[in-house]
């Protein structure tokens, strides 16, 4: 019924340690970088490098920062208002239909095809038939890779609809 999501899906509707900064909600919502307190009367700041919120919200906690997997590089760190940005290492890419892991890019095109697009962190090499110029949509060769359940990708609660 629900899939893991980022706070984009939570907007705009978020534990409190005594040292955390507090302010009052505005029209029942707390600003990015904060979540609402259990009694709904305070906004409590997220903990830098640990959790975050990106929108005005009334979530009762901040969202966990994503930890980049091995095989990924961190493009930008997690702040209180923005999640970590991770990218596949050079020579690997993340497919739309399996975003939980980086897959190795193919090293070359099948016989009778030519390469028209390079390996990028978000796409495999692109091959077209020499004659027709149509794209190749064959299976990517299986890559021996262990799929681990990442604490990120993305690190946030499930869809809260229901």
């Amino acid at each position: 019924e629900s899939a893991l999501i980022t706070q984009q899906d939570l907007a705009p509707q978020q534990r409190a340690a005594p040292q955390q900064k507090r302010s009052s909600p505005s029209e029942g919502l707390c600003p990015p970088g904060h979540h609402i307190s259990e009694d709904g009367r305070d906004c409590i700041s997220c903990k830098y490098g640990q959790d975050y919120s990106t929108h005005w919200n009334d979530l009762l906690f901040c969202l966990r920062c994503t930890r980049c997997d091995s095989g990924e590089v961190e493009l930008s760190p997690c702040t209180t208002t923005r999640n970590t940005v991770c990218q596949c290492e050079e020579g690997t890419f993340r497919e739309e239909d399996s975003p939980e892991m980086c897959r190795k890019c193919r090293t070359g095109c099948p016989r009778g095809m030519v390469k028209v697009g390079d390996c990028t962190p978000w796409s495999d090499i692109e091959c077209v038939h020499k004659e027709s110029g149509t794209k190749h949509s064959g299976e990517v060769p299986a890559v021996e890779e262990t799929v681990t359940s990442s604490p990120g990708t993305p690190a946030s609660p499930c869809s809260l609809s229901g």
Epitope: A3, Q13, R15, N57, D58, L59, F61, C158, L160
Partner: antibody
């Protein structure tokens, strides 16, 4: 469809502990708080506390703090409520109930378990 | 803790006739954000409670429109426009404006 199925009735002696389970199905378990309520014979309902399966946080009614422990097993989408140092007045039906992560919609329970009768008697 | 009181505690009803249950809180349930967190549940015989109305007047999904909620501050009412046999059970009001959340003692609705 959303279902919360609780463990069976228990009979315990005073001073003992009881652990009640609540297995969730039909929704994403880590997407909602799991709350626990109880209803003593001839009495009203009492909210005991809630567990956040997403980050492991707990929030207790002060009345039960120190005696109640809420946990979950995410792998089986099961929530647990353990009540220790039982006394006769803890004899009640214990319910689990789901609520939203938002303050504005988090204070009511849209789905409930069927209840578990816990009897404390010497 | 906020004390919730309900009246009457027992309500004999005639099918097809209206019914009304009152709920009072020991303090105002208006939150500093302007919303009022007063909810109604029905516990049918041998069942667990089920949500009827949330935040004073919002019917939960699948709840017939013969049920309606109203009120403000400390005084709230649940009305059933035309009682049906399946409406018997114990009705509870509940508040989540103040921690800890508390319930009323319940009103038992039974057919005359």
């Amino acid at each position: 469809q959303v279902q919360l199925v609780q463990s069976g009735a228990e009979v315990k002696k005073p001073g003992a502990s009881v652990k009640v389970s609540c297995k969730a199905s039909g929704y994403s378990f880590i997407g909602y708080f799991m709350n626990w309520m109880r209803q003593a014979p001839g009495m009203g309902l009492e909210w005991m506390g809630r567990f956040n399966p997403y980050n492991g946080d707990t929030f207790y009614n002060q009345k039960f703090k120190g005696r109640v422990t809420l946990t979950v097993d995410k792998s089986t989408s099961t929530a647990y409520m353990e009540l220790s140092s039982l006394r006769s007045e803890d004899t009640a039906v214990y319910f689990c109930g789901r609520s939203a992560y938002y303050f504005d919609s988090g204070g009511y329970f849209d789905y409930w378990g069927q209840g578990t009768l816990v009897t404390v008697s010497s | 803790d906020i004390v919730m009181t309900q009246s009457p505690l027992s309500l004999p009803v005639t099918p097809g006739e209206p019914a009304s249950i009152s709920c009072r809180s020991s303090q105002s349930l208006v939150h500093s954000n302007g919303n009022t967190y007063l909810h109604w549940y029905l516990q049918k015989p041998g069942q667990s409670p089920q949500l009827l109305i949330y935040k004073v007047s919002n019917r939960f999904s699948g709840v017939p429109d013969r049920f309606s909620g109203s009120g403000s501050g400390t005084d709230f009412t649940l009305k059933i426009s035309r009682v049906e046999a399946e409406d018997v059970g114990v009705y509870y009001c509940s508040q989540s404006t103040h921690v800890p959340w508390t319930f009323g003692p319940g009103t038992k609705v039974e057919i005359k």
